[in-house]
């Protein structure tokens, strides 16, 4: 026998206390699929959260964060506080990176800074709190006598026309 | 399941400043906001101001320019500074925890009371 | 003086049904959930009604809740003697990023 409540579309629930009939949401509640025997309560975005998305009798509410804040979570569940360039967020609060760590953005954590000799390369620009280092060529590249020229572009096997 | 005590002293001079902490056990300060509401004797429930566990704070405005509120997340604790004490603070003052997703206060501690009085 | 409005008093004898009503604004209940809250003497507010009609677990389903425009009401069917106690209406206003209370009701049951 077929459950009547599986004919309750979106946006409804099956009322147990009418009959099992499909009643719309009440306010401040949705149903995102069919046959549901409630309705779930809307989430609010207030305080720190800004609406998004509103609430609808079919979807929940979305939210983002204040600005100096970003969101953090599944659904943004929570918000947290912006940092400069250059620092990390502790326990404390927003914290310079240490020295031989850099941060490029308002979020996450200090990393170190790119070890160019594990490449075999040289440091050509320093690192900063800010940036990581910029490695350039090998220490052998740039020996006396080492060409600086670019070398030129491999020759293409004849018949072929460039992709 | 959690728990909230508040502390800080109950005699408090014309004035001075109350300092009072609220203290979080059995759960995490993480995603919720903390709430300060006080209840001067015989009356109404006000709210003071609320943090949220990553810093960003509201207060009522009746009240924004002598009052501060922070919260230490490695201790569990969050605290209100409130300045420039009248007669009127005379209260019991509640630490609660209010939920972020429906915004009720689910928590409360059983209140101290403050008496500010020379 | 709240920003929510409630009936200082209400009352009712054992077994009736009562309701005491908080009105407000666009603002705040217009647009946002109401929750209520508990009192007796001497202890703190306890979470009794959420979201408008959401109770918490261990909230005996005697107390329901309801909102319609800029007022909610609190309902409380079969009156016991330990509900006598005060109840608090409170809802999110916009205009302040926080929340509003209403003054409370105190509930004597009578008999």
């Known amino acids: 026998l077929q459950d009547p409540c599986s004919n309750c579309p979106a946006g409804t629930f099956c009322d147990n206390n009418r009959n099992q009939i499909c009643s719309p949401c009440p306010p401040n509640s949705f149903s995102s699929a069919g046959g549901q025997r409630t309705c779930d309560i809307c989430r609010q975005c207030k305080g720190v959260f800004r609406t998004r998305k509103e609430c609808s009798s079919t979807s929940n509410a979305e939210c983002d964060c204040t600005p100096g804040f970003h969101c953090l979570g599944a659904g943004c569940s929570m918000c947290e506080q912006d940092c400069k360039q250059g620092q990390e967020l502790t326990k404390k609060g927003c914290k310079d990176c240490c020295f031989g760590t850099f941060n490029d953005q308002k979020r996450g954590i200090c990393r170190p800074w790119t070890n160019c000799s594990l490449d075999g390369k040289s440091v050509l620009v320093n690192g900063t709190k800010e940036r990581d280092v910029v490695c350039g060529p090998s220490p052998a590249d740039l020996s006396p006598g080492a060409s600086s020229v670019t070398p030129p572009a491999p020759a293409r096997e004849p018949g072929h026309s460039p992709q | 399941q959690v728990q909230l005590q508040e502390s800080g002293p109950g005699l408090v001079k014309p004035s001075e400043t109350l300092s009072l902490t609220c203290t979080v056990s059995g759960g995490s300060i993480s995603s919720y906001y903390w709430s300060w509401i006080r209840q001067p004797p015989g009356k109404c429930l006000e709210w003071i101001g609320y943090?949220?566990?990553?810093?960003?704070?509201n207060y009522n405005p009746s009240l924004k320019s002598r009052v501060n509120i922070s919260v230490d997340t490695s201790q569990n604790q969050f605290s209100l500074k409130l300045n420039s004490l009248t007669a009127a603070d005379t209260a019991v003052y509640y630490c609660a925890r209010t939920h972020s997703y429906y915004y009720g206060m689910d928590v409360w501690g059983q209140g101290t009371t403050v008496t500010v009085s020379s | 003086q709240s920003v929510l409005t409630q009936p200082p008093s209400a009352s009712g004898t054992p077994g009736q049904r009562v309701t005491i009503s908080c009105s407000g604004s666009s603002s705040n209940i217009g647009n946002n959930p109401v929750n209520w809250y508990q009192q007796f003497p001497g202890t703190a507010p306890k979470l009794l009604i959420y979201s408008n009609n959401q109770r918490p677990s261990g909230v005996p389903d005697r107390f329901s809740g309801s909102k319609s425009g800029t007022s909610a009401s609190l309902a409380i069917s079969g009156l016991q003697s330990e509900d006598e106690a005060d109840y608090y209406c409170e809802a999110w206003d916009d205009s302040l990023n926080g929340p509003v209370f209403g003054c409370g009701t105190k509930l004597t049951v009578l008999g």
């Open positions: 943090i949220y566990y990553s810093g960003y704070t």
